[in-house]
Amino acid sequence: CKAMHVAQPAVVLASSRGIASFVCEYASPGKATEVRVTVLRQADSQVTEVCAATYMMGNELTFLDDSICTGTSSGNQVNLTIQGLRAMDTGLYICKVELMYPPPYYLGIGNGTQIYVIDPEPCPDSDF
């Protein structure tokens, strides 16, 4: 029995439009058919859930309609995109993976991706 290892990039810079993408990859100890992926944000020792989705292997990842996250899955790899980010959202984003079915349950937590968000400078007024 081995613990599940989760890998994610150490640092990602959000785009000027406030979009950040990163890959969350897990080494599955078993043949899971149902997987839950959660993105946690850790800042100032406070942890909040950013978004979560459960998917069946081979199917697409579906977040809630009002979620700021979207994603796709391919094998043991999940491509996550977080939208609507602002400078105040800079922080450590942790990928949590749970193998929900079939038994046994496995938990895997990544070391986190530090996402840096820089608010764009407002466009200067033109004198035309």
Epitope: C1, A3, M4, T54, E98, M100, P103, P104, Y105, L107
Partner: antibody
Framework: QVQLVESGGGVVQPGRSLRISCAAS????????IHWVRQAPGKGLQWVAV????????YYADSVKGRFTISRDNSKNTLYLQMNSLRAEDTAVYYC???????????WGQGTMVTVSS | EIVLTQSPGTLSLSPGERATLSCRAS???????LAWYQQKPGQAPRLLIY???SRATGIPDRFSGSGSGTDFTLTISRLEPEDFAVYYC?????????FGPGTKVDIK
Amino acid sequence: QVQLVESGGGVVQPGRSLRISCAASGFTFSSYGIHWVRQAPGKGLQWVAVIWYDGRNKYYADSVKGRFTISRDNSKNTLYLQMNSLRAEDTAVYYCSRSGSFGAFDIWGQGTMVTVSS
Amino acid sequence: EIVLTQSPGTLSLSPGERATLSCRASQSGSSSYLAWYQQKPGQAPRLLIYGASSRATGIPDRFSGSGSGTDFTLTISRLEPEDFAVYYCQQYGTSPFTFGPGTKVDIK
């Protein structure tokens, strides 16, 4: 504040049934897995069962499999444990506990005592 | 099933002393998912340490966790009167979730 409160414990005869409950408040109940953990008098902690998120996935300790059923009502923020075919060795304080963001059991109820005796 | 063994069964110490509690897992790989709990008589357990070494919210810094592979340690740097209790280790990385038998820290 974040809390779990168990209820429904009592004295029951061997072979009979009992349902205990756990009321949650102060957090988004459906976003967490919730466990039952028991402790026999003077003994250590024993994990009993867990139910995840929307209630579809449940896991049990071998000692209660087939006799106990865990369920949840997310609209009522309540967890249940239906205990059938009770045995003397099921006598214990039953705690409900939340699986926190990082997986450890971060919030515990005060416990409810279940005594199986004739 | 991952079996956890704790030692010693009882630790008799005086306030101000250092307490070192051990937890050994039957299989390696659970290091990221090892927790320590404190339980006082008549009370529910309280989470102290998760992920082998991270302190839970509100836990004083005299409590620290360490270890990897199969061997883990909970250290209380200077025992306060309120620290005399039973301590349990637990693995939560895979089902069934298992607890160690506990170590009782009592006053010498």
